[in-house]
């Protein structure tokens, strides 16, 4: 590290003095200091001498000596005060530019350290500082306004108390620039626009920034539109607004509109699409299949997407039967708006009961007319089974009836012993009935099938079981012949709790 002689942090000299600052290093050394007049520099091997033979208040400042060849980059510094009774301040710059929230150094250097106790910072013409101005002072560097704000862009003076009177520095203009985080913020409304030919339309493009220096324009299909600009300032932001008013739209007005704003940080743009139509429209659609199957006791949401212009004048869900004349509860229907022209309507059907199977229709109306979308809801049921013994054409026959949806399959089992349900170990014979007779098959109802098993003689120590199953579940009925006749064992009753 180089050494400055004298090796003290500060020197105080009188105006007119000859000042010599000597810096000694291991290798060559260099001086750096404030821009001030009349310094001469001469080198003598590993030392360098900075000299002036007529020191003035303007020589007040910090002088630093560095050793360029030093890998550690060491330096030594000394601060020179040229104590001028008429000039307590040496102002190094008359304009200071910082960004908001940076510290702003106003470089008025005190020429006499003894005056430090009586210094203050004021605005020009003796005006006090703005409230909440947080500042500190260093006799070497000047006043620092901490975390400067845009509103503190003012002209300042440094004041020192000399012999009971305040002596001011020349003024320093502080410019605090807004920090521009990026291109201006943009809004383009509406985000989408539909109009019938001949109607009026309005498109508003607005941009805002903390700094006034930005441009904004609206373009239609890459053509810049000439629109008068409105400017405003609120919430500490500058706003520029372009409003496009169309009294009677036509097809040539349709297309893509872009709102573009730019500043030194770059460009932002946002777009919308304007559609011009010949007449009102109303389109209903669903992402769901219009034919729905749900297991009894479960829930279902029916969803309809509506695309319409002008807006809907009315809409409702209707139950079209066939079971009852009940209508969906309004509280189970809700509407959500995706955007101006698209809506989703949902009907919630929780814990479906048998009487709620059937057709549900969504109806909507706008000036373009009525539209409807109908869902068909079929409920699925597990099979219910019953077996009776009868004679058909003189032959003993077991008759099994199974009812459920989808249509059940039927299997007969014969097993040894008397049991409520045949297990694998007891099974003597199995018959699959691939084509049971369909007794009833109405829309939205259960399908009832019948299967016949002709038995020449009933074995008394055996059980005959009819089993039915479908995609929902299965059911069975065990038939046990006894000497006094036949005895049937239905399964545990099928319980349904909607």
């Amino acid at each position: 590290i180089p050494v400055i002689e004298p090796s003290v942090p500060e020197l105080v000299v009188k105006p007119g003095a000859t000042v010599t600052l000597r810096c000694v290093g291991n290798g060559s050394v260099e001086w750096d200091g404030p821009p001030s007049p009349h310094w001469t520099l001469y080198s003598d091997g590993s030392s360098s001498i900075l000299s002036t033979n007529n020191a003035t208040f303007q020589n007040t400042g910090t002088y630093r000596c560095t050793e360029p060849g030093d890998p550690l980059g060491g330096s030594a510094a000394i601060h020179l005060y040229v104590k001028d009774p008429a000039r307590p301040w040496n102002v190094l710059a008359q304009e200071v530019v910082v960004f908001e929230d940076q510290d702003a150094l106003l470089p008025c250097l005190l020429t006499d350290p003894v005056l430090e106790a009586g210094v203050s910072l004021v605005r020009v013409r003796g005006r006090p500082l703005m409230r909440h101005t947080n500042y500190s002072f260093s006799p070497w560097h000047g006043f620092t306004i901490h975390r400067a704000k845009f509103i503190q862009s003012q002209d300042y003076q440094c004041s020192a108390l000399m012999g009971g009177r305040k002596v001011m520095s020349i003024s320093i203009r502080l410019k605090v620039q807004k920090v521009i985080p990026g291109p201006p913020a943009l809004t383009l409304v509406p985000a989408e626009l539909v109009r019938i030919r001949g109607e009026a339309a309005q498109i508003v493009c607005s941009a805002s920034s903390v700094d006034v220096n930005f441009d904004v324009f609206l373009q239609h299909n890459n053509t810049k539109l000439a629109i008068p600009q409105q400017s405003d300032f609120h919430n500490n932001r500058y706003q520029k607004v372009l409003t496009l008013n169309l009294d009677q739209v036509d097809f040539q007005h349709a297309g893509n509109y872009s709102c573009v704003a730019s500043n030194v940080q770059g460009k932002h743009s946002t777009s919308m699409f304007f559609r011009v139509v010949e007449s009102a429209y109303l389109n209903l659609s669903s992402e769901q299949n219009l034919i729905q199957e749900v297991t009894v006791g479960e829930g279902l949401n029916l969803k309809v997407m509506v695309e319409a212009y002008p807006g809907l004048q009315g809409f409702n869900w209707t139950y079209l039967g066939p079971f009852s004349d009940h209508q969906p509860e309004p509280k189970l229907a809700n509407a959500t708006t995706k955007d101006t022209y698209r809506h989703t309507f949902t009907l919630s059907l929780p814990r479906l009961k048998p009487s709620e199977a059937g057709r549900y229709s969504f109806l909507a109306r706008n000036p373009g007319g009525w539209r409807a979308l109908t869902f068909e809801l079929t409920l699925r049921y597990p099979p219910e089974v019953s077996v009776i013994w009868t004679f058909i054409n003189g032959s003993g026959t077991l008759l099994c009836a199974a009812s459920g949806y989808p249509q059940p399959n039927v299997t007969w089992l014969q097993c040894s012993g008397h049991t409520d349900r045949c297990d694998e170990a007891q099974v003597l014979q199995v018959w699959d009935d691939p084509y049971p007779e369909v007794l009833s098959q109405e829309p939205f109802h259960k399908v009832t099938v019948q299967s016949l098993l002709t038995v020449e003689t009933l074995e008394h120590n055996q059980t005959y079981e009819c089993r039915a199953h479908n995609s929902v579940g299965s059911g069975s009925w065990a038939f046990i012949p006894i000497s006094a006749g036949a005895h049937t064992h239905p399964p545990d009753e099928f319980l349904f709790t909607p």
Epitope: P6, S7, V8, P9, L11, V13, K14, A17
Partner: antibody, heavy 121, light 109 residues
Framework: QITLKESGPTLVKPTQTLTLTCTFS??????????VGWIRQPPGKALEWLAL???????RYSPSLKSRLTITKDTSKNQVVLTMTNMDPVDTATYYC?????????????WGQGTLVSVSS | DIVMTQSPDSLAVSLGERATINCKSS????????????LAWYQQKPGQPPKLLIY???TRESGVPDRFSGSGSGTDFTLTISSLQAEDVAVYYC?????????FGQGTK
């Protein structure tokens, strides 16, 4: 009034690092024109300046000991800390911290009582 | 480094007599720009820290009796005790702070 007090170990082993703390009152090391230095005095011998730190964090070291010394300040605690590495029996001395300021021409105008540090295995 | 040499190493003076201690620097400690000599004198009594007596070679520190005075310029300096008192028995050191490292004389007892 200004007072300074040194603290640290009284005995260190050779090759160890010595850490000395100077705790002061009556002035602030954030006030311009103020410094705190360290000076040592082997038993029966003369004074030797070691290091110095100023209000603006400018640090000065004796060139012959620079590689072994580090001086730091904690303005909020009113403390200056000196560390000296690779201690040797010849470093046995009374270590003083002292105040200096612009007013008294940068001489050491207030001294602590000193702390005797012995270096021995 | 600037070498500070004090003479004599030891001095015996009767109470009430003048005592003179010399200090010589190996190079000038006078800074011509402000006409200041960067030299100080300290007094150290047994078991105590040094005490500042004189700075700028001739400016007496506040609270120091006026029997102590400093003089000299450039490379040759003198500390004078005009009328020695019993409490003045001590070791006296000169110190230069013109060029780093700051150096002390070997002391005069």
């Amino acid at each position: 009034q200004i007072t300074l007090k040194e603290s640290g170990p009284t005995l260190v082993k050779p090759t160890q690092t010595l850490t000395l703390t100077c705790t002061f009152s009556g002035f602030s090391l954030s006030t311009s024109g103020v410094g705190v230095g360290w000076i040592r005095q082997p038993p029966g011998k003369a004074l030797e300046w070691l290091a110095l730190i100023y209000w603006n964090d400018d640090k000065r070291y004796s060139p012959s000991l620079k590689s072994r010394l580090t001086i730091t300040k904690d303005t909020s605690k009113n403390q200056v800390v000196l560390t000296m590495t690779n201690m040797d029996p010849v470093d046995t001395a009374t270590y003083y911290c002292a105040h200096q300021e612009r007013r008294s021409g940068w001489s050491f105008d207030y001294w602590g009582q000193g702390t005797l540090v012995s270096v021995s295995s | 480094d600037i070498v500070m040499t004090q003479s004599p190493d030891s001095l015996a003076v009767s109470l009430g007599e003048r005592a003179t201690i010399n200090c010589k620097s190996s190079q000038s400690v006078l800074y011509s720009s402000n006409n200041k000599n960067y030299l100080a004198w300290y007094q150290q009594k047994p078991g105590q820290p040094p005490k500042l007596l004189i700075y700028w070679a001739s400016t007496r520190e506040s609270g120091v009796p006026d029997r102590f005075s400093g003089s000299g310029s450039g490379t040759d300096f003198t500390l004078t005790i005009s009328s020695l008192q019993a409490e003045d028995v001590a070791v006296y050191y000169c110190q230069q702070y013109y060029s780093s490292p700051w150096t002390f004389g070997q002391g005069t007892k």
